[in-house]
């Protein structure tokens, strides 16, 4: 539970978080666990702590080992352990079995490709994208934020896929790889004016002033996967990233589910700390695909804090 | 020095109701996650509520779960439990204690304790 | 919910003596365990947490051991004031405590 296996490349950027997790006032130390060695917090050196994340840049083969992290509250000290292996580059094309992420899969139409760990770095777009080590080039492909789009997916699209980015730190620049592999499911598919699964329309979604609240838009719109199909929020009939309050805040990225062979997408609003004004809003699920678009409405209503278990 | 005083225990019938409280000092009240432990005459620990530090978690024990209501009044340093349809099983102890480190919604250990105060439920 | 034995139920033992205590979980707690010594009339006190880190101001005699399913208190040599009744509690899903050990002076 609090240990957690990372790898990376050798004279590549690597970033890992202490799996243990505490408030954010709370310190947190950094040690090579098989010397007990302290990790330096100064930026200057290759290898240094960051609060929760432990910083490689670059990373070595003899980094490779177990590091822990204690974090400190005023009376309590917890430890987590980051499991760290740094490889050599590989010569050839070929990844090895060990530097691969979770698997994707997807069919037809079109797909995302979701680079790993890159929520840990600081990057910025676009995404270089590599399948079997050949920058990936034409109008299907589309790097987009931090995944890659392929149109008309083909069984012959599967294989290992690399994203490519660069992390900066204080001006400095380092190169991050992360590679999964991608299946495709071969299905015939169809297209259908969208339907909203949740939430009903006119829905009244009670929440607790000063907790944090989930509004999930769940849409589907036809069987296999869909071309131009979206799900998404918004505010008094603005989006949500053009509506300017940041307690209020989109997933990123959208959770594609085939429920029944049904091909639907989740988008989830994330209220933190629900607040009176919030009751005020209007909040649209909008789903649209090349058929339409359909909108269902929510408001929220106050409850009083009830009973609920783990 | 972090202090915690339970009161409002008594005698009561059964189907009755109580309100307890607890009232905290010696550190930043709305930080910590609170929490109601219960004792029985001669008898363990049972753990009864949780509370988040801003009031908008709860957790309650099956035993309890739709009988007690947990509350807490960040600007009064104050923590609650009210109780009601009581029933004989209820007679016990009851502890306040502070979760010292729970983000919210999670678990700890409990560092400080009340002195307790006894709840018999008797006709 | 998460079921923690606590074993002996009772340990009659001389001051000095060693103590060995047993706390078994139904499922795997990982390291979210604690030990509180309680003594009558008075409220719990933390011993241990995490499974094997003393909390403030408990002596070294008091050590914690364990992982996953299986977990240990030892106290090394009992004093006078350690005879007291000992309780676990795990945190890994909401909050549950063992039944307790009684130390009770042989």
């Known amino acids: 539970k609090f240990s957690k296996q990372s790898w990376g490349l050798e004279n590549e950027a690597l970033i890992v978080r202490c799996p243990r997790q505490g408030k954010p006032s709370y310190t947190v130390d950094w040690y090579y666990s098989q010397t007990n060695k302290s990790i330096p917090t100064q930026e200057r050196n290759r290898v240094f702590a960051s609060g929760q994340l432990l910083k490689f840049l670059p990373a070595a083969v003899a980094d490779s080992g177990i590091y822990t992290c204690i974090v400190r509250s005023p009376t309590f000290n917890r430890t987590g352990y980051a499991n760290v292996t740094i490889y050599k580059k590989q010569s050839d094309c070929n990844v090895p079995d060990y530097l691969m992420y979770s698997t994707v899969s997807g069919s037809e139409k079109n797909s995302k490709i979701y680079c790993p760990t890159i929520d840990l770095y600081n990057w910025t777009a676009p995404l270089e994208w590599f399948k079997n080590c050949q920058a990936l080039q034409g109008s299907r492909y589309r790097a987009h934020k931090s995944f890659l789009v392929i149109d008309n997916v083909m069984t012959e699209d599967a294989g290992d896929y690399t994203c490519k980015f660069i992390h900066n730190e204080n001006g400095a620049n380092y190169s991050v790889t992360a590679t999964r592999s991608f299946t495709v499911k071969d299905e015939q598919g169809f297209s259908l004016f969208p339907v909203i699964g949740a939430p009903a329309q006119n829905e009244i979604k009670e929440v607790e002033i000063g907790k944090n609240a989930n509004l999930t838009c769940s849409a589907c719109f036809g069987k296999g996967t869909q071309f131009l199909a979206a799900v998404l929020w918004q505010l008094n009939g603005t989006k949500i990233t053009d509506f300017g309050e940041p307690r209020i805040q989109q997933e990123e990225g959208q959770n594609q589910s085939f429920s029944n062979g049904l091909a639907c997408l989740d988008m989830v609003l994330r209220i933190a700390d629900v607040k009176e004004e919030d009751l005020l809003l209007q909040y649209d699920c909008l789903a649209l695909n090349l058929h339409g678009l359909r909108r269902h409405t929510v408001r929220l209503s106050r409850k009083n804090p009830i009973d609920h278990h783990s | 020095e972090v202090q915690l005083l339970e009161s409002g225990g008594g005698l009561v019938q059964p189907g009755g109701s109580l309100r307890l409280s607890c009232a905290a000092s010696?550190?930043?009240?709305?930080?910590?996650?609170m929490i109601w432990v219960r004792q029985a005459p001669g008898k363990g620990l049972e753990w009864v509520s949780y509370?988040?530090?801003?009031?908008?978690?709860?957790y309650y024990a099956d035993s309890v779960k739709g009988r007690f209501t947990i509350s807490r009044d960040n600007s009064k340093n104050t923590l609650y439990l009210q109780m009601n349809s009581l029933r004989a099983e209820d007679t016990a102890v009851y502890y306040c204690?502070?979760?010292?480190?729970?983000?919210?919604?999670?678990?700890?250990?409990?560092?400080?304790w009340g002195q307790g105060t006894l709840v018999t439920v008797s006709s | 919910e998460i079921v923690l034995t606590q074993s002996p139920a009772t340990l009659s033992l001389s001051p000095g003596e060693r103590a060995t205590l047993s706390c078994r979980a139904s499922?795997?707690?990982?390291?979210?365990l604690a030990w509180y010594q309680q003594k009558p009339g008075q409220a719990p006190r933390l011993l241990i947490y995490?499974?094997?880190n003393r909390a403030t101001g408990i002596p070294a005699r008091f050590s914690g051991s364990g992982s996953g399913t299986d977990f240990t208190l030892t106290i090394s040599s009992l004093e006078p004031e350690d005879f007291a009744v000992y309780y676990c509690?795990?945190?890994?899903?909401?909050?549950?405590f063992g039944q307790g050990t009684k130390v009770e002076i042989k």
């Open positions: 204690a502070r979760d010292p480190w729970s983000t919210e919604g999670s678990f700890f250990v409990l560092d400080y």
């Open positions: 010696g550190f930043t009240f709305s930080d910590d996650a």
């Open positions: 995490d499974a094997s």
């Open positions: 509370i988040g530090g801003n009031g908008g978690t709860t």
């Open positions: 509690q795990q945190y890994n899903d909401a909050i549950t």
């Open positions: 499922q795997s707690v990982d390291d979210d």
